[in-house]
């Protein structure tokens, strides 16, 4: 049960999270003007991977596409990359988690797969979730590092005579929202994974049984130690159990005709 | 059709206050900046109070911040112009306008007059 | 407050003459996220309220003669009417909508002859 309910959160988290990088992708407000400390302009700047707008104090919104694919700066290029890498990754992810998912029955398909797929829906999210991670972070150093250069020469004018107010941005809700949306896919990753060592049917551990050769009798104690990578790569000589969802101990605890020879 | 009608104006005196209303149609009045601005009889414009559009921000100029407040009833369609301590220099016509693209005003009434004088 | 000068003070001009008036602020309306100028201009004519003319610097509103246009970015603005009429006369404001608070220049009074 226990397993079920891991798997069934994992997969619930890692959707919200997916969700999230999508919106976040979307979004708009990756970077926002900053407004403390400048003088009180009635439009309102802000961008996103794909177009820049402007908000009017007068309502009017007007946004205009980047529609150019040579002309935008290499970091915004490999943020883009880096979120749709995730976006893929994570929806690959889903789609698979959903028929690991112990729940729902699919023909006759073995503890075992539905073990391997888990591990591999849960890996994606874990990649998914650190790309989306990634592509924020860089963003938001690119945002910082232009935030301090742009300080640095605020104003700009000919002579002092003139000055043009420098717009300055800062971290947008896009950023927020995808930290958050990554470290949640991240996290349900995490969870599918625990979940897959449940899932994987162990080595069947043997009771002690004594064998009674002609000269002197000696215990031989076949499987008697566990399978140390608990993904259930080795499937040969294991038991099958029918009995609905178990953890390892109880699968274990349950002795079987199989048990004694 | 945008339609914008000013009310309120009149005769006060120094140190008095008075209360404008603008009966906005035509518009999802909310969405849209809206401004007063006074002509003086030099015929001078000054735009003496700004509310923006959506998030509903006020803004003044020096000449009339802590006297002048602007606000707006959504479910009448109603913009106010609350003015309060009035000097013989608020003396002016003063007119609604609602703003749009570039912030400018397309749209006017026809002004009331308010004249401060003892 | 942002100051807007505005120059010449009066016009006097013929009929199918081409007039140019300036207008010049104290700090760049040009704003870089999307490259417009805030910069607007009026047209005023005796006893109505003003009438939108140009917006953004140099798009012309709707309903307003091609003879009009409106050029100039960052802190100097030009309003030109390539053939004046007689129905031209009238008081020209150029406003700052880009700083609060939004602020009108003095006016040009254009005389028809």
């Known amino acids: 049960m226990a397993v079920t309910a891991c798997q069934g959160l994992g997969f619930v988290v890692s959707l919200i999270g997916i969700a999230g990088i999508i919106a976040a992708t979307c979004m708009d407000q990756w970077s926002t003007q900053d407004l403390y400390n400048n003088p009180v302009t009635a439009v309102f700047n802000y961008q996103g991977l794909w177009r820049s707008c402007v908000r009017e104090s007068s309502g009017f919104t007007e946004c205009r596409g980047y529609f150019t694919l040579l002309g935008l700066p290499a970091m915004l290029q490999a943020v883009r990359a880096l979120m749709i890498v995730g976006i893929v990754l994570g929806a690959i992810g889903l789609l698979v988690s959903i028929f690991a998912l112990k729940c729902i029955r699919i023909g006759s398909m073995e503890d075992s797969a539905k073990a391997n797929m888990t591990l591999t829906s849960g890996i994606m999210f874990i990649v998914s979730g650190l790309c989306a991670i990634a592509g924020v972070s860089v963003f938001a150093n690119m945002l910082v590092t232009n935030f301090w250069m742009s300080t640095a020469n605020m104003y700009t004018g000919m002579g002092g005579m003139v000055q043009t107010v420098q717009t300055r941005y800062t971290f947008g809700a896009a950023l927020f929202v995808g930290w958050v949306a990554g470290g949640l896919t991240l996290i349900g990753g995490v969870m599918m994974c625990i979940a897959c060592r449940g899932l994987a049917p162990e080595e069947t551990n043997y009771k002690a049984v004594s064998y009674h050769a002609s000269g002197h009798s000696v215990a031989y104690k076949p499987g008697g130690f566990k399978a140390s990578t608990g993904f259930g790569s080795n499937t040969k000589n294991k038991k099958i159990y029918d009995g609905g969802a178990r953890t390892e101990d109880e699968v274990q605890s349950y002795p079987s005709k199989h048990d004694y020879v | 059709e945008v339609k914008l009608v000013e009310s309120g104006g009149g005769l006060v005196k120094p140190g008095g206050s008075l209360k404008l209303s603008c009966a906005a149609s035509?518009?999802?009045?909310?969405?849209?900046?809206m401004s007063w601005v006074r002509q003086t009889p030099e015929k001078r414009l000054e735009c003496v109070a700004t509310?923006?559009?959506?998030?509903?921000?006020?803004y003044y100029p020096d000449s009339v911040r802590g006297r002048f407040t602007i606000s707006r009833d959504i479910a009448k369609n109603n913009l106010y112009l609350q003015m309060s301590s009035l000097r013989s220099e608020d003396t002016a016509l003063y007119y609604c306008?609602?703003?749009?693209?570039?912030?400018?005003?397309?749209?006017w009434g026809q002004g009331t007059l308010v004249t401060v004088s003892s | 407050d942002i100051v807007m000068t505005q120059y010449p003070s009066f016009l006097t001009v013929t009929t199918g003459e081409k007039v140019t008036m300036s207008c010049k602020s104290s700090?760049?309306?040009?704003?870089?996220?999307?490259?417009?100028?805030?910069l607007t201009w009026y047209q005023q004519k005796p006893g109505q309220p003003p009438k939108l003319l140009i917006y953004?610097?140099?798009t012309r509103e709707s309903g307003v003669p091609d003879r009009f246009a409106g050029s100039g970015s960052g802190t100097d603005f030009t309003l030109t009417i390539s053939s004046v009429q007689a129905e031209d006369l009238a008081i020209y404001y150029c406003?700052?909508?880009?700083?609060?608070?939004?602020?009108f220049g003095s006016g040009t009074k254009l005389e028809v002859k």
């Open positions: 700090q760049s309306l040009l704003n870089s996220g999307n490259q417009r100028n805030y």
């Open positions: 406003q700052n909508n880009y700083f609060y608070p939004f602020t």
């Open positions: 953004w610097a140099s």
């Open positions: 306008a609602r703003s749009y693209n570039g912030n400018s005003l397309p749209y």
């Open positions: 035509g518009f999802t009045f909310s969405s849209y900046g």
């Open positions: 509310i923006s559009g959506g998030d509903s921000y006020t």
